[in-house]
């Protein structure tokens, strides 16, 4: 029950996180005109990953897309790439995790397969969250650098009384949405990985017959050959041939890679 709850919560948290990452990527307010200690203008500038906008005090808003690829700063391109990779990984992770949910039964899918899928989606969510956090952080760093550069030469004298004012940009709402969304996706991914351990069968990888020193604890698993087909009600039974070979549901048996996550 706890495993199902952890998995379900992980899925929901990741879903919210990825929705947030998508929203942040699409938002225009990655950087907004700094209003503090600036001459008050009747025009407000803000910029996103894909276009820059100007809102006049009247309410009129005009946005212009960045219709160039080569002319854009490499950092902006890198941020775009990180956010898109985050979205793609997150979307695939969501798709995988839907089938991995314990509460959803798809055919005769083994718990071990679900555990595998849960782990895969968890890792995808973690990477997706990290991509979003990295993208937003790179952009934020770029803003901070530009902010202090523009502050240094905010007012540049141009022959006597004529002055030019440089517009400074500060953190926009999209950055905070991105950070929170990336964090949620990351947390959701971790929850999925934790849930994966609970989903994995904790049984020992038995051979057909196991001899113990005490002499009276023979563990024999009947019905092995019947189970080898993979169909029928006793799908938990192990194959008794091929020594160390394991069925799909045995993949989680100790020692397993999932114990080292």
């Amino acid at each position: 029950m706890a495993v199902t709850a952890c998995q379900g919560l992980g899925f929901v948290v990741s879903l919210i996180g990825i929705a947030g990452i998508i929203a942040a990527t699409c938002m225009d307010q990655w950087s907004t005109q700094d209003l503090y200690n600036n001459p008050v203008t009747a025009v407000f500038n803000y910029q996103g990953l894909w276009r820059s906008c100007v809102r006049e005090s009247s309410g009129f808003t005009e946005c212009r897309g960045y219709f160039t690829l080569l002319g854009l700063p490499a950092m902006l391109q890198a941020v775009r790439a990180l956010m898109i990779v985050g979205i793609v990984l997150g979307a695939i992770g969501l798709l995988v995790s839907i089938f991995a949910l314990k509460c959803i039964r798809i055919g005769s899918m083994e718990d071990s397969a679900k555990a595998n899928m849960t782990l895969t989606s968890g890792i995808m969510f973690i990477v997706s969250g990290l991509c979003a956090i990295a993208g937003v952080s790179v952009f934020a760093n770029m803003l901070v650098t530009n902010f202090w550069m523009s502050t240094a030469n905010m007012y540049t004298g141009m022959g006597g009384m004529v002055q030019t004012v440089q517009t400074r940009y500060t953190f926009g709402a999209a950055l905070f949405v991105g950070w929170v969304a990336g964090g949620l996706t990351l947390i959701g991914g971790v929850m999925m990985c934790i849930a994966c351990r609970g989903l994995a069968p904790e049984e020992t990888n038995y051979k057909a017959v196991s001899y113990h020193a005490s002499g009276h604890s023979v563990a024999y698993k009947p019905g092995g050959f019947k189970a080898s087909t993979g169909f029928g009600s006793n799908t938990k039974n192990k194959k008794i041939y091929d020594g160390g070979a394991r069925t799909e549901d045995e993949v989680q048996s100790y020692p397993s890679k999932h114990d080292y996550v």
Partner: antibody, heavy 118, light 113 residues
């Protein structure tokens, strides 16, 4: 048709107060910003204040302490409360609608004359 | 506050001739975000309220004759009347529509020579 009609002007003694009104029709004050601009006899235009559609206000820094702009959305009417009036406040006061583009003033009222004199 | 300086104070031009009015601002009125100059031109005829002619320094208001045109960028702007008509006799004002408080130039009185 867009119309702006100012009222409330007249003769007032120095130090007195006056409230000007601007009745707007043909548009809503919650959709467009409205400015007050004044013009002293034989002089140029001087911007006084603005109230934007969202309700935010801006003032001429020299007049800010004495003048207050407000509006009544239900009456679609704009107001300019003027306190501690001085002789130099004598002017024709215009209300003008803010254009949707470019922050210009596209429709103007005929103005109301305020005379501050003892 | 932004200082708007108009020149000349008055101008006499023959009918059909070109009239040019200049306006200079103490700070740039160019917004880097959209590369638009927030300068507006008005015409005020005697006994009338001002009339909006040009916004964004060069965009004509609808209904304004084509002979009126605006140019310039940053701090220096020009209003040009390509062929002066009798009805163009008025006082012309430029206005900073970028920084608060919005400020007007002193005005240029245009007369017929």
């Amino acid at each position: 048709e867009v119309q702006l009609v100012e009222s409330g002007g007249g003769l007032i003694q120095p130090g007195g107060s006056l409230r000007l009104s601007c009745a707007a029709s043909g548009f809503s004050l919650t959709t467009y910003g409205v400015h007050w601009v004044r013009q002293a006899p034989g002089k140029g235009l001087e911007w006084v204040s603005v109230i934007w559609a969202g309700g935010s206000t801006n003032y001429n820094s020299a007049l800010m302490s004495r003048f207050t702009i407000s509006r009544d959305n239900s009456k679609n009417t704009l107001y300019l409360q003027m306190n501690s009036l001085r002789a130099e406040d004598t002017a024709v006061y215009y209300c003008a609608r803010a254009a949707y583009y470019g922050n210009g003033l596209d429709y103007w009222g005929q103005g109301t004359l305020v005379t501050v004199s003892s | 506050d932004i200082v708007m300086t108009q020149s000349p104070d008055s101008l006499a031009v023959s009918l059909g001739e070109r009239a040019t009015i200049n306006c200079k601002s103490s700070q740039t009125l160019l917004n880097s975000g959209n590369q638009k100059n927030y300068l507006t031109w008005y015409q005020q005829k005697p006994g009338q309220p001002p009339k909006l002619l040009i916004y964004w320094a060069s965009t004509g208001e609808s209904g304004v004759p084509d002979r009126f045109s605006g140019s310039g960028s940053g701090t220096d702007f020009t209003l040009t009347i390509s062929s002066l008509q009798a009805e163009d006799v008025a006082v012309y004002y430029c206005q900073n529509a970028y920084f608060y408080p919005f400020t007007f130039g002193g005005g240029t009185k245009l007369e017929i020579k």
